[in-house]
Interface confidence: low
């Protein structure tokens, strides 16, 4: 499919001008290559009319130009003094006319309306309001006032001062007679439809002395604004419909076959399933304007979008609308990253987030998409050292691997973590990406003790058991803090006995804390990685207390300390059962503690996005 994009249809009137913008991927080659505008012939060829290399056909001499804007990947063709002969099929493109790097454009030039003398022209957008003013003389002040529409050869009464309203205008028209000082009456038509366009005649009086005024009403269908975005990227539709619809329900819909427009999202709470997890309807301003953000753009998102206002929250005749034609460029600069990541309860996930590598110094964010109302995405963590309180000890945002990708690690997973998450930066807003976390059946691969208590001044050894599948991975221990996880020295204690059907390649790697101090209290993670790419992690909270008896603590021998809701493994260490981690500030022995995350986050269900790009929690 050609990555060139422009307007499919351009309509104008004889004598007017048009400006046609064509978009291309702004690669170095594309920015400098030839741009052209050609007319398609009946037998298939395409005759150049104007190009960026200076050529201008005699047909266009003195009335056309082509301007390239390499910095934003567009070029613009301006054509003036249009005639009906200019109607036809054209291409805007790059390189050689026959190469296929082009976009088809249909140009339709129509004859200007043949208007009667003294005709007032009203040009109004679809769905808006028009006021037709009708002057009259004093002698007709007390006589019947009326508005007719010319249908074919015959005038058809639309409204009059005796109270008649044509059924086609019911509920959206009124006739106002100004105060006695002004010799003027007005007809106001709301929620204009395309079918309202045409010639009108307003009249005061019915005899030969009546006053008449001709009006031509042109109802404009909004020209779609062209939007060119990268696959996997993000688009924002800004919709400003005016204060008169500030209190009317708003919607964004996507045109399907014919005139159907399927609601994507509206302010009444409707959202199309295909956009679950990747759409936000941003707050309405007092003037009724709003915006819709869609992330994780897919090929099938391309098409015509309309935003509008109607009490039903969907497109109806007479809705004021704004239009966009979205083109999704498959030659995307945004790298592929998994759209679904799977983890098990008690386990972990490592999510790779792409960002614009030109903005390495930008602040990185990760937020949790919530579907309630119109959608929101509260931040959970950022690269400046802020972590939402409920996620302390189990969430970290790492700048690694860098060069256009950062990593988010979330461990101690529960079913409540299933959902959609957005990767963001405070830089290029087009690089918002979405990932869905799914919680699947299974056991965590890494095995660590439950929360551990260390004694001041003594030595503590904490084991982490790695199965054979991680034999080729680098194994590490680190201490979590709100800016990341600082690596700590660890010892390889040889093969682990914690895994059934696992050979000598399984590993027991221990963290040793010598001469424990108060500063050692906190969350510790063991994990695996390959270079700068992170895999699974497991977390242990180490509490520090005053000395009770002499000696060092080797947690692997703490069989007797096992709490009732933990299961003791043969190797003599504790594994946390698939439960939410308790508040670390309450020690492991104090069991009757509610899960603070449950209270704060409420219940969220996972919705399958149907994505084929899936990733397990333990591999990259």
């Amino acid at each position: 499919k050609s990555p060139i994009f422009g307007p499919e249809e351009v309509n104008s009137v004889e004598g007017n001008s048009v400006s046609i913008t064509c978009y291309y991927p702004p690669t170095s080659v594309n920015r400098h290559t030839r741009k052209y505008w050609c007319r398609q012939g009946a037998r298939g060829g395409c005759i150049t009319l104007i190009s960026s290399e200076g050529y201008v056909s005699s047909k266009y001499a003195g009335r056309a130009n082509l301007t390239n804007f390499p910095e934003n990947g567009t070029f613009v063709v301006n054509i003036a003094q249009l005639s009906q002969d200019d109607s036809g099929r054209y291409k805007c493109g790059l390189g050689i006319n026959s190469r296929g790097l082009s976009f088809d454009v249909s140009l339709e030039v129509s004859q200007g309306p043949g208007l009667l003398n003294d005709t007032k022209v009203y040009t109004v957008d679809l769905g808006r309001t028009v006021t037709i003013n009708c002057p009259f003389k004093t002698e007709n002040a007390q006589k019947r006032k009326s508005l007719y529409k010319q249908i074919g050869l015959y005038p058809v009464l639309v409204i009059d001062s005796s109270g008649y309203v044509n059924p086609n205008y019911t509920g959206r028209i009124r006739l106002d007679i100004q105060g006695t000082g002004q010799l003027l009456f007005s007809v106001v038509i709301n929620q204009l439809r395309l079918s309202d366009a045409g010639q009108y005649l307003c009249q005061a009086g019915d005899d030969s002395n009546s006053n008449k005024k001709n009006a031509d009403l042109q109802v404009l269908k909004p020209e779609p604004e062209l939007v060119y975005e990268d696959l996997r990227g993000s688009v924002t539709f800004h919709c400003a419909l005016g204060p008169e619809v500030a209190n009317v329900a708003k919607f964004l819909c996507r045109q399907s076959s014919g005139e159907n427009c399927d609601v994507v999202v509206n302010t009444l709470g409707k959202r199309a399933p295909a956009f679950e997890g990747r759409i936000l309807l941003n707050p309405q301003d007092k003037d009724g304007s709003f915006s819709v953000v869609i992330t994780g753009l897919r090929k099938e998102d391309a098409g015509r979008y309309l935003c509008g206002a109607h009490s039903d929250g969907q497109l109806q005749e007479g809705s004021p609308i704004q239009a966009w034609q979205l083109f999704v460029n498959e030659e995307s600069t945004i790298p592929r990253s998994p759209t679904v990541v799977k983890g098990v309860a008690g386990g972990s996930v490592a999510v790779l987030c792409p960002y614009n590598r030109k903005e390495s110094k930008s602040i990185k964010y990760w937020c949790l998409w919530e579907g309630a109302q119109n959608g929101r995405c509260p931040l959970l963590v950022d690269s400046e050292g802020w972590v939402k309180a409920q996620y302390e000890g189990r969430l970290s945002l790492l700048e690694e691997p860098g060069n256009g990708t950062f990593t988010v690690i979330l461990n101690q997973l529960t079913s409540r973590d299933a959902g959609f998450y957005w990767c963001l930066t405070n830089g290029d807003t087009l690089w918002r990406t979405t990932v869905e976390i799914k919680i699947i059946e299974g056991e965590p691969n890494l095995k660590v003790p439950g929360n551990v208590t260390a004694v001041l001044g003594e030595t503590l050894k904490v084991p982490c058991h790695f199965p054979c599948k991680f034999s080729s991975y680098e194994k590490y221990w680190c201490k979590w803090n709100n800016t990341g996880c600082q690596a700590l020295p660890s010892q390889d204690e040889g093969p682990s006995k914690a895994f059934v059907n696992c050979d000598e390649n399984s590993r027991l790697v221990s963290l040793t804390l010598n001469l424990v101090t108060r500063a050692d209290e906190g969350w510790y993670w063991c994990g695996v990685k390959q270079g700068h790419f992170y895999g699974e992690t497991a977390a242990v909270y180490v509490a520090v207390e005053e000395r009770k008896a002499a000696g060092s603590r080797d947690v692997s021998l703490a069989k007797a300390d096992a709490a009732p809701d933990e299961k003791v493994l043969d190797s003599g260490f504790r594994e946390i059962e698939n439960k939410a981690i308790q508040d670390p500030r309450l020690f492991a022995e104090e069991k009757a503690v509610a899960d603070t995350r449950d209270q704060a986050d409420g219940s969220r269900a996972s919705v399958d996005s149907g994505s084929s790009e899936e990733q397990g929690g333990s591999s990259r």
Epitope: P283, V293, Q373, L379
Partner: nanobody
Framework: EVQLVESGGGQVQAGGSLRLSCVAS???????????RAWFRQAPGKERELVSA????????YYVDSVKGRFTVSTDDAGDTMYLQMNSLEPEDTAVYYC??????????????????WGQGTQVTVSS
């Protein structure tokens, strides 16, 4: 927990100016990190109303109609302090002014209940 502290309130004649400041208690905390920051006001016996709001990294700034052209919101270079410059003050501007911030990336800006962090408020009195 982050706390916001306002200053700059006071008494002024109609037509005068005031500049309100809002500083975050933690130096590590920057307004640039926030999804939205705002100034609200509450006149006696009335509901708290939004005066101005800026979404995350200043992409969109809103002003209530009654202050448009008179009030301007800004942030210092470091992002530690938010300001509300109030010019051509009118008696109807008399109220307690609050700065607020939140970390949610979207939802209704006009609803004060969606804001996580609040200042204690500073009184502005405009006499005719």
């Amino acid at each position: 927990e982050v706390q916001l502290v306002e200053s700059g309130g006071g008494q002024v004649q109609a037509g005068g100016s005031l500049r309100l400041s809002c500083v975050a208690s933690e130096r590590t905390f920057s307004y640039y990190d926030l999804a939205a920051r705002a100034w609200f006001r509450q006149a006696p016996g009335k509901e708290r109303e939004l005066v101005s709001a800026s979404t995350w990294n200043g992409g969109y700034t809103y002003y209530v109609d009654s202050v448009k052209g008179r009030f301007t919101v800004s942030t210092d270079d470091a992002g530690d302090t938010m300001y509300l410059q109030m010019n051509s003050l009118e008696p109807e501007d008399t109220a307690v002014y609050y700065c607020a911030a939140r970390r949610a990336y979207s939802s209704d800006l006009h609803d004060y209940r969606t804001f996580d962090y609040w200042g204690q408020g500073t009184q502005v009195t405009v006499s005719s």
